[in-house]
């Protein structure tokens, strides 16, 4: 696969696992419990996110409330909001540079340099996606360590929610999407044949004296 | 086997803080899933739960007594610790500790008497 | 806070009969996690402790004569005494162990004829 084809199929994973991050970032379904009210007809989901508590009946109705004050969240709440906005802003930063770097575009002048530009965002991506992976394993493993703890009680006993399964994909895909743009740059650096054009300089027309310039005559 | 029993001052006035300590073998509050539990019993009445203290230092205290009772626990010597501030007659009853395991309290301690009483 | 009602307060039976005391939450304690129902049921003799007799609604604890019986779901719990002896006489208090503040039902006295 030439390096071009590499970088393209890198950035649309990129984007999609970007899109995903966002989403997952904004859900509020990082924990969730299934709660039986008053009768077993009638069921209750609670929903934790970062941003957001919901409370979901089966009815369909459902009540969020958004968290009052910052401070009165968990460390881990708050850790995971900074890890979770702040790999959201780096794929930001690492879609330009990655752009800056594609083959299909003047920002930076084909060669060596664009090259190490476009491994650049590959490796922003990379970082990018570990940087997600861990407030969602981080959350993954305080819902599961309180699922099997016997001080809290089964109203408190969470799961894990959608957003951490969306999360995980989507750092999925920034990690492959970040390891084919740093291939297709490491392809061009390496094979320039399979990725810059090669220049070619014109042929000189021969003069009218055939070969050599009269100054060549002694 | 396991036991539990309470000690503490059997009366005091109103407007004192109430200490009481519970001295427990036969377990560990270093162990993994050991709780203690306080519960009390006005005479002649139900059982009212308080607080409970577990072996990783969380605690879950009844929030209509939140800001006047503390918790604590000294595994080392098999103790654990209750404080009621700023009692009042209405806090005269039968106080007990109780060895948790997750929400139920399967071992009691005898009970100690305790007056609010000016 | 989940309140615990039960019913009656007191009753009186003669020894060998068959006795039912009954424990309303005012929410359910069903876990759908598990399809377990969280409650459990206390015998305090007079002069004594509270003693844990049976837990997840129908799970006797160990050393608990088989003549308690738990049952029931959702928020209507009852307990059972199949036939009772003079030595059943202590109050029967229901509590749940759903949630925190643990609570506890206000009691059963149990008198014997």
């Known amino acids: 696969m030439g390096s071009a084809a590499l970088e393209i199929l890198g950035l649309v994973l990129c984007l999609v696992g970007w899109g995903g991050l966002i989403l997952a970032c904004g859900l509020p379904m990082w924990q969730v419990t299934a709660f039986l009210d008053h009768n077993i007809v009638t069921a209750q989901t609670t929903w934790k996110g970062l941003w957001m508590s919901c409370v979901v009946q089966s009815t369909g109705h459902m009540q969020c409330k958004v968290y009052d004050s910052v401070l009165a969240l968990s460390t881990e709440v708050q850790a995971a909001r900074a890890l979770t906005v702040g790999a959201v802003l780096l794929a930001f930063v690492a879609l330009f540079v990655t752009l800056a770097g594609a083959q299909c575009t003047t920002c930076v002048a084909p060669g060596p340099a664009k090259a190490r530009v476009a491994l650049t965002g590959g490796v922003l991506y990379l970082l990018c996606g570990l940087l997600a992976l861990v407030p969602l394993c981080w959350f993954a493993n305080i819902v599961v360590r309180e699922f099997y703890d016997p001080s809290v009680p089964v109203s408190q006993k969470y799961e894990l929610g959608a957003a951490l399964y969306i999360g995980w994909a989507a750092t999925a895909l920034l990690m492959v999407g970040g390891g084919l743009l740093c291939c297709g740059a490491w392809v061009c650096t390496s094979r320039p044949d399979l990725s810059f054009p090669v220049k070619y300089s014109a042929p000189r027309r021969p003069t009218a004296t055939g070969d050599y310039d009269k100054k060549n005559y002694v | 086997q396991v036991t539990l029993k309470e000690s503490g001052p059997g009366i005091l006035q109103p407007s004192h803080t109430l200490s009481l300590t519970c001295s427990f073998s036969?377990?560990?509050?270093?162990?993994?899933?050991?709780?203690v539990n306080w519960i009390r019993q006005p005479s002649g009445k139900g059982l009212e739960w308080l607080a409970s203290i577990w072996w990783h230092g969380k605690t879950y205290i009844n929030p209509s007594l939140k800001n006047r009772l503390t918790v604590s626990k000294d595994p080392s010597n098999n103790q654990a610790f209750l404080e009621v501030t700023n009692v009042d007659p209405a806090d005269t009853a039968t106080y007990y500790c109780?060895?948790?395991?997750?929400?139920?309290?399967?071992?009691w301690g005898q009970g100690v008497m305790v007056t609010v009483s000016s | 806070d989940i309140v615990m009602t039960q019913t009656p307060s007191s009753q009186a039976v003669s020894a060998g009969e068959k006795v039912t005391m009954s424990c309303k939450s005012s929410?359910?304690?069903?876990?759908?996690?598990?399809?377990?129902?969280?409650l459990a049921w206390y015998q305090q003799k007079p002069g004594q402790s509270p003693k844990l007799l049976i837990y997840l609604t129908s799970t006797r604890e160990s050393g608990v004569p088989d003549r308690f019986i738990g049952s029931g779901s959702g928020t209507d719990f009852t307990l059972t005494i199949s036939s009772v002896q003079a030595e059943d006489l202590a109050d029967y208090y229901c509590q749940q162990h759903y949630s925190y503040p643990l609570t506890f039902g206000s009691g059963t006295k149990l008198e014997i004829k």
């Open positions: 929410q359910s304690l069903l876990y759908s996690g598990d399809q377990k129902n969280y």
């Open positions: 036969g377990f560990s509050l270093n162990t993994y899933g050991v709780g």
């Open positions: 109780a060895h948790a395991r997750a929400q139920l309290l399967d071992y």
